[in-house]
Structure formats: structure tokens, C-alpha cells
């Protein structure tokens, strides 16, 4: 995209004048831009996972589905668990909105959250004893 020049009247985030509170519309644009049918990777992966429901009504979004690895090891070609490899979660840091209080349902704070979106198979870290 083309870099647009900043309006000189706009304060920088480092500025003491930068607003601590902003008004945000919760009507999301392009919500379905990546709309796709749910894949079955969670079953076909060599490090399969299950999806667990995490609901928190004080958060926006309230419901987040998180991945939990099914095995410690990975699944080999025969469908058996191989403990020479490890299943580990793939974690993504996301920003959510946290309600400031139950009595102020339209006032939020930004909060960082670490969410597991799937699992992958890795070689284990081997510690050699001296």
C-alpha cells in the first residue's frame, strides 16, 4: 500500500497528549474474509489435537476454542504413538478486550492472551548427562 503522510495534528503514541481511551466500533469489518470449511487437520496431523471451549463473559470475544495436544508423542505411519518425537502446541499471542467491570459492560481494556491454535510434531530436546 501507499504510505500516507500523517496529519501533523495527530499525536504520536509516545506523546503525553496521546489518548488513553478510544472509541471502537465492535462491528467487525471483513469478519468472514478467510471463511473456510473447518479442516480436519486436528485428526490427520501426526500431532493431533482436540479443541476445548474457553468462555469468559467478561472478555470480547467471549468464546475462544483452544487446541490441546492429544498425545505427548507423535503418531507414526502405523497410527501408533512414537515417544521419540513430541507433540507441542502452536501458540499465538492475540489481543482481546477485557470488560473493566461487571457494572460497566461497555468499557474495556486491551489484554494480551496466549492461545494454542494447533499442535505440531518436533524432535525432543535431549539433555546429555555428563
Amino acid at each position: 500500500g501507499i504510505a500516507m503522510p500523517r496529519n501533523p495534528g495527530c499525536p504520536n503514541a509516545e506523546d503525553k497528549n496521546f489518548p488513553q481511551n478510544v472509541k471502537v466500533s465492535l462491528n467487525i469489518l471483513n469478519k468472514s474474509v478467510n471463511s473456510r470449511r473447518p479442516s480436519d487437520y486436528y485428526n490427520r496431523s501426526t500431532s493431533p489435537w482436540t479443541l476445548h471451549r474457553n468462555e469468559d463473559r467478561e472478555r470480547y470475544p467471549s468464546v475462544i476454542w483452544e487446541a490441546k495436544c492429544r498425545h505427548l508423542g507423535c503418531v507414526n505411519a502405523e497410527g501408533n504413538e512414537d515417544h521419540h518425537m513430541n507433540s507441542v502446541p502452536i501458540q499465538q499471542e492475540i489481543l482481546v478486550l477485557r470488560r473493566e467491570s461487571q457494572h460497566c459492560p461497555h468499557s474495556f481494556r486491551l489484554e494480551k492472551m496466549l492461545v494454542a491454535v494447533g499442535c505440531t510434531c518436533v524432535t525432543p530436546i535431549i539433555h546429555h548427562m555428563a
Epitope: 467487525i28 469478519k31 479443541l51 471451549r53 470480547y60 470475544p61 467471549s62 468464546v63 475462544i64 476454542w65
Partner: antibody, heavy 121, light 107 residues
């Protein structure tokens, strides 16, 4: 206009399975989960489970002991509830209801009209 | 599972009466209560969410209150269309459970 339209009444034999559909319209299907609730004749409401059409995630009431399978087809905005190993006590009206993932204070705001399932030999 | 016990299970009242339905949770580990109204042969309709808040299009004669294990639905002045069965639902502990219902009948 938001609508959840369910499939028609079913009569099933004990031991068989039933699959009820719930077609959604009037909103973005993947922004909402679909929950399933049933009501036996003259009884109260019983939560069965939830399906997230976006991720494919499911969570069930353990009371149903693996007999319930919830799925969704994003291409047709339709959710499905399959109940296997039917017994007479599964005779009930089965409802689908949507549940906002963005703000679950908006949970269960719209319901399907209900599907009557009768299990009888 | 958390059991939700509604009382009374049935209630006779007249148009204009003030009516209170209570819902008690078997433990206090719940976040909120939602209330639903159901008429014969129809799907439930959400009345109150998050214990206190009125759902869209619901008349202001309905109100909700409570905390911990005890919750209340109040109808300040009964109207003919309010005769129905009312259910509470606990949110925050799985599986989410409904009360057994309170049938409100015309006296």
C-alpha cells in the same frame, strides 16, 4: 431476519439413530456457535452440547455418553445433531439455538422451532 | 453438575399481581443466570441475561436480580400474555443446566 429452521418430525425404532438439521440464515454463521437443547414431554430443558461451525470444535454433555455427534456445514449454514442408540427416553423435542462467540451475553437469543423425535417400537 | 432448583414449581396468580420466581444453585460457582419464558408448543424465549439485563424487546415489567446461589425473576404487574413456564439457566459451570421450570397459571 435471523432464522433457525429445523428439519421435520421423526419416528425412530429403539437402537437406531436420528439426524436433525438446523439451517441458519440472516446472520454470519461462523460468528455464532450452535447449541442443542432437548425437552422431553412435560419436562424441563436439557443442554446437550455445542458446535463451533468455524473451528469444528464440539463440547458435549457427558450425560449422553458419546451418543451425540454435532457437526456443521459452513457452505450451507446448516448444523446437525445426530443421536445414536436411541431409547424410549430420548423421545423429546430437540431445539437448536445460536450463541454469539463475540459476546456471549447474546447467548441463546434465537431458537429453532423444534424437531419432535419419537422413539417407539 | 450444578443443580438449579426453581421455586415454586407452579404458581397461580391474577392479572396485575406482582410475581417472584426464585432459582437456587446447588453451589455458588456460577457466573450468571439467564431466564427464559416458554409457551406451550413454542421454543423458549430469552427474557433476562447476565442476571439483570433485559433482552431486546422484553417489557420492563420483567426484572432479574441475585448473586451467589440465589437468583430471582420478578414480574411487577402480570399481563395476560405472561402466563407461561419460566426457566432459569446457570452460566459458568459445565454442563450448563436449566432449572426444572415454574408454571405460571391464571388464578
Amino acid at each position: 431476519e435471523v432464522q433457525l429452521v429445523q428439519s421435520g418430525a421423526e419416528v425412530k425404532k429403539p437402537g437406531s439413530s436420528v439426524k436433525v438439521s438446523c439451517k441458519a440464515s440472516g446472520y454470519t454463521f461462523t460468528d455464532y456457535e450452535i447449541h442443542w437443547v432437548r425437552q422431553a414431554p412435560g419436562q424441563g430443558l436439557e443442554w446437550m452440547g455445542v458446535n463451533d461451525p468455524e473451528s469444528g470444535g464440539t463440547f458435549y454433555n457427558q450425560k449422553f455418553d458419546g451418543r451425540v455427534t454435532l457437526t456443521a456445514d459452513e457452505s450451507t449454514s446448516t448444523a446437525y445433531m445426530e443421536l445414536s442408540s436411541l431409547r424410549s427416553e430420548d423421545t423429546a423435542v430437540y431445539y437448536c439455538t445460536r450463541y454469539s462467540k463475540w459476546d456471549s451475553f447474546d447467548g441463546m437469543d434465537y431458537w429453532g422451532q423444534g424437531t419432535t423425535v419419537t422413539v417407539s417400537s | 453438575d450444578i443443580q438449579m432448583t426453581q421455586s415454586p414449581s407452579s404458581l397461580s396468580a391474577s392479572v396485575g399481581d406482582r410475581v417472584t420466581i426464585t432459582c437456587r444453585a446447588s453451589s455458588g460457582i456460577i457466573s450468571y443466570i439467564d431466564w427464559f419464558q416458554q409457551k406451550p408448543g413454542k421454543a423458549p424465549k430469552r427474557l433476562i441475561y447476565a442476571t439483570f439485563d433485559l433482552a431486546s424487546g422484553v417489557p420492563s415489567r420483567f426484572s432479574g436480580s441475585g448473586s451467589g446461589t440465589d437468583y430471582t425473576l420478578t414480574i411487577s404487574s402480570l399481563q395476560p400474555e405472561d402466563f407461561a413456564t419460566y426457566y432459569c439457566r446457570q452460566v459458568g459451570s459445565y454442563p450448563e443446566t436449566f432449572g426444572q421450570g415454574t408454571k405460571l397459571e391464571i388464578k
